[in-house]
């Protein structure tokens, strides 16, 4: 006798107006008397629309809660899992129901903002940017709401950035306990004269830092060979163990650049009578702390001029 | 307390490979980079290889092409396979677990290339 098992019912994908974080959601099976003590477990695929790939959960709960990108629509499926230990150890699986949620299509394409750029700078706030859509009226202007797990709800950008009194950017500080998880943005938009599509962002704030450039370059000349090049890490919440340094070095007409995780660095000059022997480093969160990031811009040149008398370094 | 915990160093001669493994003993691995670095005697401590939270890598370009590193999240544990092995790869190797909250270190794994 062949055993089934019927799928979940009443499976949805709903918006609960978090720019993207959605709930998937189902009730139990109808089940027959025989297997109600079973358990149950229901193994769940969904994926944005275009994407190649499903993400699949096993789960017992009648719930799960991801992350989308709404610039897009989502699809999902379900099925319902037998325990083998009331199977008699065979694998019983019901048939897969499925359900999607579609992305709002008011407003043309040519409406959504574009270029959206954010940059979490020093890992102390956030500025994102944006240009108008391609054909939007005189009288459009955008508003822009984030959201991240701990927030209660959505929230909107309390300080524009403005061009021609209309919102082209955001700042956002004091993001408490923001980073290492998803960070959702919507950016929509008003006129009288038509609907603006929305557009929709998702990161991880780690992974845009761009840090303040090294200050208090130092360089130092031993037995007229071994350089030693030290400078500071930049003030700010970014501890020093994060941070990666690019350093290009200049002896005379010659440049090169090297890489290291510390903040000084130590080789021998290219030839004894070089005149001058010049630094510059920028930096960047590294691999420790975050999966990217921006670098900083280069920091001052330091440069030894060379021993060419008492008054000289 | 977090600790971290290196095995599969040993002996071995040159060409040969080993792989290497780190085990956390707490769930740091999540949000943190680890990194492999080594230390041979009278030298400098060198990181040889990285890899972030999401997989991103970094290599040293003395091991480039012969190491690689990677990471298994559900079993908190990182490993770096090494192939083509070579006498100057000789060192104790030490994994580091690392982020902007935390910053761990092994007590180390002794690897010997010789024939």
């Known amino acids: 006798l062949e055993i089934k098992v019927n799928p979940p019912q009443d499976f949805e994908i709903l918006d609960p107006g978090l720019l993207g974080y959605l709930y998937l959601q189902w009730k139990p099976p109808v089940v027959i008397e025989k297997f109600k003590g079973c358990t149950l477990e229901y193994e769940l695929k969904y994926r944005n629309v275009d994407s190649d790939s499903w993400k699949t959960i096993i789960t017992r709960n009648l719930i799960y809660k991801d992350g989308f990108d709404l610039n897009k629509g989502i699809e999902g499926k379900i099925r319902t899992h037998l325990s083998e230990h009331c199977t008699n150890g065979s694998e019983v699986q019901s048939p897969w129901i499925e359900a999607s949620y579609g992305i709002s299509d008011e407003g043309s394409l040519e409406t959504k903002i574009q270029d959206m750029k954010c940059i979490y700078y020093n890992w102390q706030y956030l500025v994102c940017s944006w240009k108008p859509g391609k054909t939007v009226y005189s009288d459009t202007n955008y508003t822009m709401f984030f959201w991240y797990e701990g927030l209660d709800h959505a929230l909107q950008c309390a300080d524009y950035l403005q061009h021609d009194e209309k919102n082209v950017g955001c700042k956002l500080s004091n993001l408490d306990s923001s980073d290492y998880k998803d960070f959702f943005i919507c950016v929509n938009g008003s006129s009288k004269l038509e609907p603006i599509r929305s557009s929709y962002t998702v990161f991880q704030l780690q992974n845009i830092v761009k840090p303040l450039p090294p200050e208090f370059l130092h360089i130092s000349v031993e037995n007229s060979i071994d350089i030693r090049m030290k400078w500071s890490t930049p003030g700010g919440p970014i501890p020093p163990r994060c941070y990666t340094y690019e350093i290009v070095i200049r002896e005379d007409d010659i440049s090169w650049e090297s890489a290291t995780d510390k903040n000084d660095m130590k080789l021998k000059r290219r030839a004894n009578e070089s005149e001058d022997l010049c630094f510059f480093v920028r930096c960047k969160v590294n691999i420790y702390c975050a999966d990217d990031g921006i670098w900083s811009e280069w920091s001052e040149e330091e440069c030894w001029e060379g021993y060419t008398g008492p008054d000289s370094k | 307390q977090v600790q971290l915990q290196e095995s599969g160093g040993g002996l071995v001669q040159p060409g040969g490979s080993l792989r290497l493994s780190c085990a956390a003993s707490?769930?740091?691995?999540?949000?943190?980079?680890m990194g492999w670095y080594r230390q041979a005697p009278g030298k400098q401590r060198e990181r040889v290889a990285g890899?972030?939270?999401?997989?991103?890598?970094v290599y040293a370009a003395s091991v480039e092409g012969r190491f690689t590193i990677s990471r298994d999240n559900a079993k908190n544990t990182g490993y770096l396979q090494m192939n083509n092995l070579k006498p100057e790869d000789t060192a104790v190797y030490y994994c580091?677990?690392?982020?902007?909250?935390?910053?761990?270190w092994g007590q180390g794994t002794q690897v010997t290339v010789s024939s």
């Open positions: 890899i972030s939270s999401g997989g991103n890598t």
């Open positions: 707490g769930s740091i691995f999540n949000t943190n980079g």
């Open positions: 580091r677990v690392a982020g902007r909250q935390d910053d761990y």
